[in-house]
């Protein structure tokens, strides 16, 4: 089995997590993609998903989460704005590919959000403050329900299913961009990995 790895990101309340999930292959470009949280002892829960089929460069906003799929570069951009301490947890991007199981993108993200406080060495909020303007978006976050044993997702709570932002733009201030790359385990890599493991097993017994 593929070892699941995590990357840890530490941010302060009010900041923005900005990650890029790298899905690499063209065949996944139009596939519906989702951002999930994995809580201890629970199945992965889908917080937001792109439309189906996923539209190019079309922001989908669900609460404080904004997803934007860039087909031409094979990147799904995930932003979680105005982070709160309770947002801390383990997250992952997945690609829906029914009837098959969702395809998980590696690595998972361990987000740690701490209370912000002034006087932190090296931080000057006034000089490093960024302002992001997210265009108004209305979308239906209709995420599929899966019950596969390996990666299970749930539909988001009813309250987040229909989301409409006001006509005015949302100003996202005090933003720190966390840029990361997620590697997709491609078919051939997986094939090579299995071959390597088979060889290792073979040599171990001889």
């Amino acid at each position: 089995a593929t070892k699941l790895t995590e990357e840890k990101y530490e941010l302060k309340e009010g900041q923005t997590l900005d990650v890029k999930c790298d899905y690499t292959l063209e065949k996944f470009a139009s596939s519906q993609k989702a951002w999930q949280i994995i809580r201890d002892g629970e199945m992965p829960k889908t917080l937001a998903c792109t439309e189906r089929p996923s539209k190019n460069s079309h922001p989908v906003q669900v609460g404080r989460i904004i997803l934007e799929d860039y087909h031409d570069h094979g990147l799904l951009r995930v932003r979680m704005v105005n982070l709160q301490v309770e947002d801390s947890g383990l997250y992952q991007c997945v690609i829906y590919q029914p009837p098959k199981e969702p395809h998980m993108l590696f690595d998972r993200i361990r987000l740690v959000v701490t209370k912000g406080f002034s006087g932190t060495p090296g931080s000057n909020e006034n000089s490093t403050q960024n302002v992001y303007k997210i265009p108004p978006t209305t979308t239906k976050a209709l995420c599929p329900l899966y019950t596969s044993p390996r990666t299970v997702t749930q539909a988001p709570p009813k309250s987040t299913a229909d989301v409409s932002t006001p006509d005015s733009e949302i100003n996202l201030t005090n933003v720190t961009d966390i840029i990361r790359e997620q590697k997709l385990i491609s078919e051939e890599d997986l094939e090579q990995k299995l071959i390597s493991e088979e060889d290792l097993h073979h040599h171990h017994h001889h």
Epitope: T24, E26, Y70, D72, H73, G74, I179
Partner: antibody
Framework: EVQLVESGGGLVQPGGSLKLSCAAS????????MHWVRQASGKGLEWVGR??????????YYAASVKGRFTISRDDSKNTAYLQMNSLKTEDTAVYYC????????????WGQGTLVTVSS | DIVLTQSPDSLAVSLGERATINCRAS??????????LHWYQQKPGQPPKLLIY???NLESGVPDRFSGSGSGTDFTLTISSLQAEDVAVYYC?????????FGQGTKLEIK
């Protein structure tokens, strides 16, 4: 093991045509875009063009120097990419390499050994 | 089209010494802070070989004396301790926009 083997090179007169083939093996051919890159003797590398996958409707893109004269195609059932070269000029003389990227706008990790095309009268 | 200009055109470095090759793009080759800029090594009679992808990622099997850095329009390939087998021509290449383009190449020799 990923392998790319070019064929079809040779001597052709200016104004003539030639079709190069790139036979691929060792990976799921239909999943990846395929590119052609050329190199004139003693010169640098020049990207010729690329063809995307079925998911992207086999879209093609070309360098300005060959646009309108060269056509890239692929046959996923044969694991083969092609470069049809028409209205050849002496400056098209080069070694032509077939290369495969690692995904959307990704790096060229795999290259063929190249096939020589000579355009001369 | 994005023009990539490498400097110097040729470089002679003593064995064991550091070699540095620069690549400047006429416009940014970044998308979301990802630099779609790659480095290749080519020896006579051989196809190019990938060394570094997306500015700073070392390709599997490439010795760690090779490293890449930079973003936006300015990039650098560094060989920390030149070995005899590193004599070759080095190319940068961008894939951020069509048409993809290569730098003109830098010939690396031993002093």
């Amino acid at each position: 093991e990923v392998q790319l083997v070019e064929s079809g090179g040779g001597l052709v007169q200016p104004g003539g045509s030639l079709k190069l083939s790139c036979a691929a093996s060792g990976f799921t051919f239909s999943t990846y875009a395929m590119h052609w890159v050329r190199q004139a003797s003693g010169k640098g590398l020049e990207w010729v063009g690329r063809i995307r996958t079925k998911s992207s409707n086999y879209a093609t893109y070309y360098a300005a120097s060959v646009k309108g004269r060269f056509t890239i195609s692929r046959d996923d059932s044969k694991n083969t990419a092609y470069l049809q070269m028409n209205s050849l000029k002496t400056e098209d003389t080069a070694v032509y390499y077939c290369t495969r990227d690692m995904g959307i706008r990704r790096q060229f990790a795999y290259w063929g050994q190249g096939t020589l095309v000579t355009v001369s009268s | 089209d994005i023009v990539l200009t490498q400097s110097p055109d040729s470089l002679a470095v003593s064995l064991g010494e550091r070699a540095t090759i620069n690549c400047r793009a006429s416009e940014s080759v970044d998308t979301f802070d990802y630099s779609f800029l790659h480095w290749y090594q080519q020896k006579p009679g051989q196809p190019p070989k990938l060394l570094i992808y997306r500015a700073s990622n070392l390709e599997s099997g490439v010795p760690d004396r090779f490293s890449g850095s930079g973003s936006g329009t300015d990039f650098t390939l560094t060989i920390s301790s030149l070995q005899a087998e590193d004599v070759a021509v080095y190319y940068c290449q961008q894939s951020n926009e069509d048409p993809y383009t290569f730098g003109q190449g830098t010939k690396l020799e031993i002093k």
